[in-house]
Structure formats: structure tokens, C-alpha cells
């Protein structure tokens, strides 16, 4: 598949809006409900909300000889999460990433927290159409990983995963291991 | 025009098996999902699973897994269900409803749906 | 299994009056919710689906609305051609599981 768009979303947003109907507003919404934060420790004496980076992805499918009818909207889920007062210098990684690094014994990973089947239809050159289920993230979350190494370590493969801060019961919906395996 | 003709009414002895078909038309057979649809007094309407005619993969709820067995002949654009080991808790009437999509994204709703098919149990 | 609860199982309205069906799910199901209309000789139509967005071919008399867990269907000019029996379904966790119907009569 190749990616049309990408945008950095925080997520701050704690229940999305549906889209109104409408003819043209198409693409699924997140059928999890909206992204989240965490509310968790710098340390023992400093109580902060820590934001996941997200990024909002349109892509459109292909099987190779069939490409998807419409872009499908996913999440992607990136980086480090950080306190909110600071992700506004996370991207230039100043500040932030000093701060966070010095404060805390614990890296804060933005990883997939919920995902669902999809199914989406793909036109063919021959006129036909096909369609397959995908699975695509809609929701991320603020993992924790405790380092293994020396605290400026920013070298993921080292961490080991700790106990996350909220739990957040997955949907029942069968899903796929790989992201975009399609039956 | 799409249309979803499905077989005529069944009466069938317990223990039997019988296979149910839902002709299609009016649209391209591949490109969408196919579900079942069973029908009784008590218990309303329940989903019994769906398949997907481009790869002949099915998903069942697993109430019916041991009952229902969902198949397509593309060349036909039909949709099979088979049920087996009839007993009178089968006796219902079976719907064939196609997925619903808009702009090529599935909402979850069955958009059209079939006449149904009428199977009684009996001895 | 995500439970589809329609409290109502009949109802009766005259001609012309605003009727709403309600529909609620034992779990939040993110809007993914449609709305059937099953007339007395066994015909199925889609009505409503993701909630809130009119299938093609119904009737903008026909609407829906709701969030989390509570749904519901409104008709707002009841005609003739409306008496059947209306069902909720859900489709945001499979299996589908769909509500025990309002049976709508006239008055």
C-alpha cells in the first residue's frame, strides 16, 4: 500500500466526535472510542499527565493487482510519550527530553492499544471488486519500560516492559497478527 | 437492481442436513461480505456467521459454529449454507444479507437482504 | 456477546405522529449500530446505519441518534407503509447480536 498523508496528532482528545452523515465523509471512525492519556508519576512527589505522539495515516490497500475504493484512516503509534507540559518541545527534542530523562528511571513508549477488523473493498483493473478484512490500529497508549542500561539510553531494544499504567479491556473483535494481513 | 433469491421453503426430518442457497445479482459477487441471518419466535434474530466470497473464508458466532457451514460458488454468484444434525431448535427461517459498504468501508450493516428461507424439523 | 435491549416490544401510534424506538447495548459499541425494518411478510430493509446515516432509498422521515450504549430510531410523520416490526443491531464486537424487535401497530 503506499501512504497519501500523515499527520502528528497528541492524544488529548478524550471522545471524538462522529462524523455527521454524510455521502462523502465515508472513512471509518475509530470504533474504539477516542485516544487517552494516562495519568501517571515524574516521580514520587510530582503527579503529571503523560501524552501518547500519535500519528493519523491514510493509506490506500493494495493486493497488488487491486487497490482499496477509498484511503483507509489508522493511527500510528510513535515515540515516547511525554508530560503534556512539554510535548510542545518534543518534536525539536530539547527540553523535554532532557527533563524527562532526568527525572525518571522509567521510559514512557507510545504503543497500539486497541485495534479492530476492517473491511474494506478493493477495485480491480478487470472491472471486478474484491474484499478483504484488515486490522488497523484506533487507539494508542502510554506503555511503560523500565531501562536497563544508563538513564540517557535511548536505545528501545534495552527495555524491558514494566507494568502499564491503565489497563484498557480489548474488544472482543477477532484480529489479525499482522497489521495488514487481508482474508 | 441488487437481488439476494434465496432457495424455497425446506421440511426436513431430524438428524437430516439441509443446504440453503442465496442467488445473487446485480452486483460484483467478490466484493462483498455475505452473512446468514437465522430467524425464530424465542430468540429474535441471531447472526450466524458471514464469508467472504473473494478468499471463500468464513467467520462464524460460535453458537453455530458446529451447525453452520458457509460456502460461495463464484462462478455462480451464489451463497451455500449447510446446517446439520436438524433438530427442532433449527426449525427458523434462515436470511442470506450482504454487507453494506460505502466509498468501499463496511460500517458492520447488511445492506441487502434475502427473502429468507423457510426449514421445519420434523419427524 | 454484546447484549441488544429494545424495551418496547410494541407499540402503537396513529398516522402522522413522531414515534421513536429505543436500543440499548449491555457495552459501549462506538456508534456501530443499524436499524432494520421487517415488514409482517418477512421483508428485511436496511434503515439507519453507523447510528445516524440514512441508507439509500429510505426516507428522510427516518432518523437515528445516540452514542455509547443508548440508541434510538425516530420516525417523525408515521405513514401506513411504516407498520412493520424494527430491530437494532450491533456491530461493533462480533458476533452481531441484534435487539428482540418493537412491533409498531396503528392506533
Known amino acids: 500500500f503506499k501512504n497519501d498523508a500523515t499527520e502528528i496528532l497528541y492524544s488529548h482528545v478524550v471522545k471524538p466526535v462522529p462524523a455527521h452523515p454524510s455521502s462523502n465523509s465515508t472513512l471509518n471512525q475509530a470504533r474504539n472510542g477516542g485516544r487517552h492519556f494516562s495519568n501517571t508519576g515524574l516521580d514520587r512527589n510530582t503527579r503529571v499527565q503523560v501524552g501518547c505522539r500519535e500519528l493519523r495515516s491514510t493509506k490506500y490497500i493494495s493486493d497488488g493487482q487491486c487497490t482499496s475504493i477509498s484511503p483507509l484512516k489508522e493511527l500510528v503509534c510513535a515515540g515516547e510519550c511525554l508530560p503534556l507540559p512539554v510535548l510542545p518541545n518534543w518534536i525539536g527534542g530539547g527540553y523535554g527530553t532532557k527533563y524527562w530523562s532526568r527525572r525518571s528511571s522509567q521510559e514512557w513508549r507510545c504503543v497500539n492499544d486497541k485495534t479492530r477488523t476492517q473491511r474494506i473493498q478493493l477495485q480491480c483493473q478487470d472491472g471486478s471488486t474484491r474484499t478483504y478484512k484488515i486490522t488497523v490500529v484506533t487507539a494508542c497508549k502510554c506503555k511503560r519500560y523500565t531501562r536497563q542500561h544508563n538513564e540517557s539510553s535511548h536505545n528501545f531494544e534495552s527495555m524491558s516492559p514494566a507494568k502499564p499504567v491503565q489497563h484498557h479491556r480489548e474488544r472482543k473483535r477477532a484480529s489479525k497478527s499482522s497489521k495488514h494481513s487481508m482474508s | 437492481e441488487v437481488q439476494l433469491q434465496q432457495s424455497g421453503p425446506e421440511l426436513v426430518k431430524p438428524g437430516a442436513s439441509v443446504k440453503i442457497s442465496c442467488k445473487t445479482s446485480g452486483y460484483s459477487f467478490t466484493g462483498y461480505y455475505m452473512s446468514w441471518v437465522k430467524q425464530s419466535p424465542e430468540k429474535s434474530l441471531e447472526w450466524i456467521g458471514e464469508i467472504n466470497p473473494t478468499t471463500g473464508g468464513s467467520t462464524y458466532n460460535q453458537k453455530f459454529k458446529a451447525k453452520a457451514t458457509l460456502t460461495v460458488d463464484k462462478s455462480s454468484s451464489t451463497a451455500y449454507m449447510q446446517l446439520k444434525s436438524l433438530t427442532s431448535e433449527d426449525s427458523a427461517v434462515y436470511y442470506c444479507?450482504?454487507?453494506?459498504?460505502?466509498?468501499?468501508?463496511?460500517?458492520?450493516?447488511?445492506?441487502?437482504w434475502g427473502q429468507g428461507t423457510s426449514v421445519t424439523v420434523s419427524s | 456477546d454484546i447484549q441488544m435491549t429494545q424495551t418496547t416490544s410494541s407499540l402503537s401510534a396513529s398516522l402522522g405522529d413522531r414515534v421513536t424506538i429505543s436500543c440499548r447495548a449491555s457495552?459501549?459499541?462506538?456508534?456501530?449500530l443499524s436499524w432494520y425494518q421487517q415488514k409482517p411478510d418477512g421483508t428485511v430493509k436496511l434503515l439507519i446505519y453507523y447510528t445516524s446515516r440514512l441508507h439509500s432509498g429510505v426516507p428522510s422521515r427516518f432518523s437515528g441518534s445516540g452514542s455509547g450504549t443508548d440508541y434510538s430510531l425516530t420516525i417523525s410523520n408515521l405513514e401506513q407503509e411504516d407498520i412493520a416490526t424494527y430491530f437494532c443491531?450491533?456491530?461493533?464486537?462480533?458476533?452481531?447480536?441484534f435487539g428482540g424487535g418493537t412491533k409498531l401497530e396503528i392506533k
Open positions: 457495552q459501549d459499541i462506538s456508534n456501530y
Open positions: 443491531q450491533q456491530g461493533n464486537t462480533l458476533p452481531r447480536t
Open positions: 444479507a450482504r454487507e453494506g459498504y460505502y466509498s468501499g468501508i463496511s460500517y458492520d450493516a447488511m445492506d441487502y
